[in-house]
């Protein structure tokens, strides 16, 4: 067992250009707040998934109005530490995620209003009882300083804090095969209590002769490293030289959470989810009230005077969540159209449009045309998001800025020779044809098919097509 | 600015159909989108059938040849059909529009949520 702690150093603009805008004014006086989330592992899970291993929620900082004209200064802070407690081991791996939460303090109808100003997140390694690290996070404009650590509650020592410490019965030495607890000198290890042979690396225990493995490990005495790959089923050792899961008994078998939370079963082990008012790995941490302000995005707290009775959370439209924490899907409706892509800001829905588009929700075709001019001659034809020229005779290209070659189609029948003109072609026809495209046969008697040939050209004369 | 006023809903054995109303009503310039989600009990919001921005309608797979959405423009208002009700659709149903106001801005607006149970 042991505690998580966080302390807040700072938060404020980060460095370079575009400074955040001051969250408060004198017209919104507010304050912030910290939340802390805690997951096992180094698994890049979604910010709604349980925080396994804890979470925690700062006092609020103090009230602050933003001073006319002046830039968005660090913003004053709530004091002490976030202290998140576990019960069991420390999985010496672990995801974080750190929000900064604002609370107005206007006139607002039914109390003041939160929102979330920034999320942070990351993975880390972390030996219990080591010193605090100190960590630089940056959410959009806004950066935020903090320092954390692991310790571990007495009796339990250790990098994991599975190891048991008591007071020396002696002044001078420890008994019979037992060793000082180091860092603390004047204590001595406490006898082995767990199952013989229990890795003490990888394995801990809460009763005498058990052995329980930390993730990614298994086996009776928890030396053997987890390795699904070549195995065919996701549940317990199956021998200690392939390391491989096969069926055995579940993790879920039990249930070991805790005040009525719900046993469901991960690749590497188990998840709990909590009834409203507990956390914590198997929901066993409480104490959680509505004076804690427990519920966010307006949410309204109801129950939870004391720390024995669980708080509800009743959500606005559009929360949901124990905590009101989690945003509903506006996005899945698809209001973004001509294939824009939909984003939820929170506190607006935004389209993201294709090219061609444009409006709030990628409603107006754009001019495909405007500001595109054809070359030449040519008229610009809109459709689908993008503009194409139509040429004029003896130009082509996407804008007719190439001169197209007019006889390349072979347009003169019946042998007839082409020649590119500046207005397009000209046709020399074969003997016995006449017409634009010598399309015509003349008749043996000099009569031809057509009506009268053109006053001034005979036929055989080149005919020029216009 | 704009309410969402739902109707229908109630108690009904496994087989059995009810119908869903939802009627938009207040500073209306269009309706963008409109549609209907739901929350079973202890889990995550999800839409279950809607008219996109694009006009096309979108059913979730759980309810697709069971449930039928329709629209009336004129009234302004969306409808749920839902036929061979199962156990696991009893939830609580919101619907829900973006809206284009009168002022041209877009918003998004839901109900204020029907309960519908299906007895085994």
């Known amino acids: 067992a042991g505690v998580f702690e966080l302390q807040i150093h700072s938060f404020g603009p980060g460095p370079g250009p575009g400074a955040p805008r001051s969250p408060c004014s004198a017209r919104l006086p507010c304050r912030l707040f910290f939340r802390v989330c805690l997951k096992p592992g180094l698994s890049e899970e979604a910010a709604e998934s349980p925080c396994a291993l804890g979470a925690a929620l700062s006092a609020r900082g103090p009230v602050y109005t933003e001073q006319p004209g002046a830039p968005a200064p660090d913003l004053p802070l709530p004091d002490g530490l976030l202290q998140v407690p576990f019960r069991d081991a420390w999985p010496g791996t672990f995801s974080f995620i750190i929000e900064t939460w604002r609370e107005e303090l206007g006139d607002q109808i039914g109390g003041p209003a939160w929102s979330l100003l920034a999320r942070v997140a990351g993975r880390r390694r972390l030996a219990a009882g080591g010193p605090w690290a100190r960590d630089i996070q940056r959410a959009g404009a806004w950066e935020l300083r903090f320092s954390y650590r692991a310790r571990c509650e007495p009796p339990a020592v250790g990098t994991a804090c599975t190891r048991l410490c008591r007071p020396r019965s002696a002044p001078s030495r420890c008994g019979p095969g037992l060793r000082p607890c180091a860092p603390l000198e004047d204590e001595c290890e406490a006898p082995l209590v767990c199952r013989a042979g229990c890795s003490p690396e990888h394995g801990f225990c809460e009763q005498p002769g058990e052995c329980r493995c930390l993730e990614g490990w298994t086996g009776p005495l928890c030396t053997v490293p987890v390795s699904t790959s070549s195995c065919l089923s996701p549940r317990g050792p199956s021998s200690a030289t392939t390391g491989c899961l096969v069926p055995g008994p579940g993790p879920c078998d039990g249930n070991p959470c805790a005040n009525g939370g719900s046993c469901s079963e991960t690749p590497r082990s188990f998840e709990c989810t909590c009834p409203r008012g507990f956390y914590g790995l198997r929901c066993e941490v409480s104490g959680v009230t509505c004076a804690d302000g427990p519920c966010f995005n307006g949410g309204l707290c109801v129950g939870g005077a004391d720390p024995d009775s669980a708080y509800i959370c009743h959500c606005p439209p559009g929360f949901q969540g124990s905590n009101c924490e989690k945003r509903v899907d506006r996005c899945s409706l698809q209001p973004c159209r001509n294939g824009g892509l939909c984003l939820d800001l929170g506190h607006a829905l935004r389209c993201r449009c294709r090219a061609g588009f444009a409006g709030p929700r990628c409603e107006h075709d754009l001019d495909d045309c405007a500001g595109r001019a054809c070359a030449n001659g040519g008229t610009c034809v809109e459709g689908g998001g993008a503009h194409r020229c139509s040429c004029a005779l003896g130009f082509g290209g996407r804008d007719c800025r190439e001169r197209a070659d007019p006889c390349a189609a072979r347009p003169c029948a019946h042998g007839g020779r082409c020649y590119a003109h500046f207005s397009g072609l000209v046709c020399a026809c074969a003997p016995g044809y006449m017409g634009a495209r010598c399309e015509f046969p003349v008749h043996p008697d000099g009569a031809s098919a057509l009506p009268a040939a053109p006053p001034g050209l005979r036929p055989g004369d080149p005919q020029r097509y216009l | 600015q704009v309410q969402l006023v739902q109707s229908g809903g109630g108690l009904v054995q496994a087989g059995g159909s009810l119908r869903l109303s939802c009627a938009a009503s207040g500073s209306i310039f269009s309706i963008n989108a409109m549609g209907w989600y739901r929350q079973p009990p202890g889990k995550q919001r999800e839409l279950v059938a809607g008219f996109t921005g694009d006009g096309s309608t979108k059913y979730a797979d759980s309810v697709k040849g069971r449930f039928t959405i329709s629209r009336d423009n004129a009234k302004n208002t969306v409808y749920l059909q839902m036929n061979s009700l199962k156990p696991e659709d009893t939830a609580v149903y919101y619907c829900?529009?973006?809206?284009?106001?009168?002022?041209?801005?877009?918003?998004?607006?839901w109900g204020q949520g029907t309960q519908v149970t299906v007895k085994p």
């Open positions: 829900a529009a973006d809206v284009q106001l009168l002022n041209s801005d877009y918003e998004f607006y």
